[in-house]
């Protein structure tokens, strides 16, 4: 399946010339990524990332998805993608629309994970998974 479609999803990447990430964070394209080893629900995962001065990852390009898949263990990780049931569409937490494909969709699965498969997978927001946080490199 086509994970990303070719239309503009309304997200503009922030230009950053930094290359320094905190300890335990991974650097990619002027951004820093933290892959947790503990697990929690999606809401708690959002708060977890906030506590590190970051947000759940916005995986809005195929290159970023591949980078993260390459460094994930055989685990599922929450990302900053949620299903807006009233709109019948997926949005990133920065409110930009995701027009690509999400597998494993179910009326109770309103959050998304990456990691075990090559795609974005719908998941219950209440189940505990690891999480990927993202922030600007300094």
């Amino acid at each position: 399946p086509q994970i990303f479609n070719k239309s503009n999803d309304g997200f503009t990447t922030t230009r950053s010339y930094g290359t320094v990430c905190p300890k335990d964070w991974e650097f990619y394209q002027a951004r820093c990524f933290f892959l947790s080893t503990s697990e929690s629900s999606w809401n708690e995962s959002r708060d977890f990332c906030k506590g590190k001065g970051s947000t759940l990852a916005i995986v809005n390009t195929p290159e970023k998805l591949k980078f993260l898949q390459d460094i994930t263990d055989a685990e599922k990780y929450f990302i900053g993608l949620i299903y807006h049931r009233e709109e019948k569409r997926w949005r990133w937490i920065n409110n930009s629309v995701f027009n690509g494909n999400v597998t494993n969709q179910n009326q109770n699965f309103n959050c998304a994970t990456i990691g075990l498969t090559k795609t974005f997978d719908a998941a219950s927001c209440d189940i505990s998974y690891r999480r990927i946080c993202e922030k600007n490199a300094k």
């Epitope: 905190p22 300890k23 947790s36 080893t37 503990s38 977890f48 906030k50 506590g51 590190k52 001065g53």
Partner: antibody, heavy 119, light 111 residues
Framework: QSLEESGGGLVQPEGSLTLTCTAS?????????MCWVRQAPGKGLEWIAC????????SYYARWAKGRFTISKTSSTTVTLQMTSLTAADTATYFC????????????WGPGTLVTVSS | NIVMTQTTSPVSAVVGGTITINCQAS???????LSWYQQKPGQPPKLLIF???KLASGVPSRFSGSGSGTQFTLTISGVQPDDAATYFC????????????FGGGTEVVVK
């Protein structure tokens, strides 16, 4: 899950000592750092150093500890702290603590081992 | 390096009362790096609160944490005699440039 320190005791000024921290009930892995913290008699806690408990060999030190103290992971269950050029100011109870990399807290502590520097 | 400054000791409490202990960071920190510990004489510290407000496993709910930026607070509601101890805050992040830092400790006396 527990930690236990060993190797403390009486040491002469300018002497050296190596403390060992042994983990039981869990393996040292990528989820943790292992740290040393000390407490002089009647005083507060002072962070000394931490080392990655997993595949990385990264170690981090308090500025005052660099050069005189060396932290090392020596096996899947042990971490050591080598101390040199000891003075009376180093007299303290030395604690080993497990540092959670996700939450940046020290969630498991050993009972401590007393180091006394005196002639 | 970040310096953590705590409420001056000792703090007196009455059984059933409420006390707060403050911890001030010398510069703004992410709340995810702040934890609280209880230590009794002859014992190692015990983790009470992590991520500024999350209760560690097995810790009574009368303990709570709050705060952000430079100001953090540990609150004990319904103080018990067993709560007599010294309490430390910890800025738990370290790297090649900065170290973890404990507050100086606050002794709590229960009357």
């Amino acid at each position: 899950q527990s930690l236990e320190e060993s190797g403390g005791g009486l040491v002469q000024p300018e002497g050296s000592l190596t403390l060992t921290c042994t983990a039981s009930g869990f393996d040292l892995n990528n989820y943790y750092y292992m740290c040393w913290v000390r407490q002089a008699p009647g005083k507060g806690l002072e962070w000394i150093a931490c080392t990655h408990a997993g595949s990385s060999s990264s170690s981090y030190y308090a500025r005052w500890a660099k050069g005189r103290f060396t932290i090392s992971k020596t096996s899947s269950t042990t971490v050591t702290l080598q101390m040199t050029s000891l003075t009376a100011a180093d007299t303290a109870t030395y604690f080993c603590a497990r540092h959670d990399r996700d939450y940046d807290d020290m969630d498991l502590w050993g009972p401590g081992t007393l180091v006394t520097v005196s002639s | 390096n970040i310096v953590m400054t705590q409420t001056t000791s000792p703090v007196s409490a009455v059984v059933g009362g409420t006390i707060t202990i403050n911890c001030q960071a010398s510069q703004s920190i992410e709340y995810g790096y702040l934890s609280w510990y209880q230590q009794k004489p002859g014992q190692p510290p015990k983790l009470l609160i992590f991520y500024a407000s999350k209760l560690a496993s097995g810790v009574p709910s009368r303990f709570s944490g709050s705060g952000s930026g430079t100001q953090f607070t540990l609150t004990i509601s319904g103080v018990q005699p067993d709560d007599a101890a010294t309490y430390f805050c910890l800025y738990g992040y370290f790297d090649d440039y900065s170290g973890a830092a404990f507050g100086g400790g606050t002794e709590v006396v229960v009357k």
